[in-house]
């Protein structure tokens, strides 16, 4: 058993550590930023590009809040999701309704996760002393990629290459709070 | 798949210390916590403490502080965990284990065992 | 130090039984409990968290409950690769501790 992928019903399957049910997430804050900023050189005709790096789709933006089991986190985290058409970058539309969808006939170009990023988020939980975090998988960047019959639904689990690794600094760690603090700001967050 | 491999066993002198490394693959070790555990011969499961490789970040056990450390090499996924001042109660195996979160356990190292004798 | 007691510390049981392990906390420690397995030799592997929450791969015939300060894992029909020593876990406060374990040995 690896890691698992748990879906953040917006599309795209994230892989995450242990498998931990989500509710649908919270869309308070959907910043739905329609970019289509992953394409390369513009291909020479819509029709005959062969390049994988001349096909482009949108990255939409949303923010939620983690939850495990009965905890919540303390702010809400900001992730991509990899959505729309892939097409060729210079007739994709930067907003939906815009333009027109350019449907390859051939091979389907699908829009999925390129890379990842980690964000560890302080979990306010009922009760409980001891300092809770979790770390949470989340897409930093989308991609558009050819898949031939032979593809199956696992390739759109890869998890890319991998972001340049930070440099390892001390932080001071989250202090344990008090049961009614812990209950008191999660009311509060609802 | 995700895999957690340990050094192999050691024999060590009262007084002495030992450095037990986890070397983590499937997965960055930034994006986890790091937990230590261990089990005395025939005993039960003891935690030890967790810590953050992202940022350094660390929770010992009231029962080891002072005298244990857990670092990672972020570089080489590869976790450690030293245990200083060793003494006869100390001869255990040690495990790694690794999760997304600060309270639970969800993949653990096949274990290393530290025996502590004069 | 919050003490969590298992009981029993060991049983007795045949393929297809239906087997309860308890596991009491010395105080409130809502629903953090995790539940693990051990078999002779081996590293513990992760079974429940969450009291309930079954870690995907596990198969349904674990179960856990409780909350507060009693839990308790069953399985509802016991396979022979189930024979092994179970161990509960608090997730609650620092230190987080373990159960004594309870072994599970064939009749």
């Known amino acids: 058993q690896g890691w698992q992928a748990f879906k953040n019903d917006a599309t795209e399957i994230i892989p995450e550590l242990g498998e931990y049910p989500e509710p649908p997430p919270e869309l308070e804050n959907n910043k739905t930023m329609n970019r289509a900023e992953n394409g390369g050189r513009p291909p020479h005709h819509p029709f005959e590009t062969k390049d994988v790096s001349e096909y482009s789709c949108r990255e939409l933006h949303f923010t939620r809040y983690v939850t495990d089991g009965p905890c919540r986190s303390a702010k809400p985290v900001t992730e991509l999701v990899c959505s729309g058409q892939c097409g060729p970058a210079r007739l994709l539309p930067n907003a939906i309704g815009r333009g027109k969808w350019w449907r390859p006939s051939g091979p389907d170009f699908r829009c999925i996760p390129d890379r990842y990023r980690a964000q560890r988020v302080q979990l306010l939980c009922p009760g409980g002393e001891a300092p809770r975090a979790r770390k949470v998988r989340l897409v930093a960047s989308c991609k558009c990629k050819r898949l031939t019959r032979f593809h199956n639904q696992s390739e759109l689990k890869d998890f890319g290459t991998e972001a340049a690794r930070p440099q390892k600094g001390r932080k001071p760690r989250p202090r344990a709070r008090s049961a009614k603090a812990n209950q008191a700001e999660l009311e509060n967050a609802y | 798949q995700v895999q957690l491999v340990q050094s192999g066993a050691e024999v060590k002198k009262p007084g002495a210390s030992v450095k037990v490394s986890c070397k983590v693959s499937?997965?960055?070790?930034?994006?986890?916590?790091q937990h230590w555990v261990r089990q005395a011969p025939g005993k039960g499961l003891e935690w030890m403490g967790w810590s953050d490789p992202e940022i350094g970040d660390t929770e010992y056990a009231s029962k080891f502080q002072g005298r244990v450390t857990m670092t990672e090499d972020t570089s080489t996924d590869t976790a450690y965990m030293e245990l200083s001042s060793l003494r006869s109660e100390d001869t255990a195996v040690y495990y790694c284990?690794?999760?997304?979160?600060?309270?639970?356990?969800?993949?653990w190292g096949q274990g290393t065992t530290v025996t502590v004798s004069s | 130090d919050i003490q969590m007691t298992q009981s029993p510390s060991s049983l007795s049981a045949s393929v297809g039984d239906r087997v309860t392990i308890t596991c009491r906390a010395s105080?409130?420690?809502?629903?953090?409990l995790a539940w693990y397995q051990q078999k002779p030799g081996k590293a513990p592997k992760l079974l429940i968290y969450?009291?309930?929450t079954r870690l995907s791969g596990v198969p349904s015939r674990f179960s856990g409950s409780g909350s507060g300060t009693d839990f308790t894992l069953t399985i509802s029909s016991l396979q022979p690769e189930d024979f092994a020593t179970y161990y509960c876990q608090q997730g609650d406060t620092l230190p987080y501790t373990f159960g004594g374990g309870t072994k599970v040995e064939i009749k």
């Open positions: 284990a690794t999760g997304d979160t600060t309270y639970k356990f969800d993949f």
């Open positions: 105080q409130d420690i809502h629903t953090y």
């Open positions: 969450w009291a309930s």
């Open positions: 499937g997965f960055p070790i930034k994006d986890t916590f």
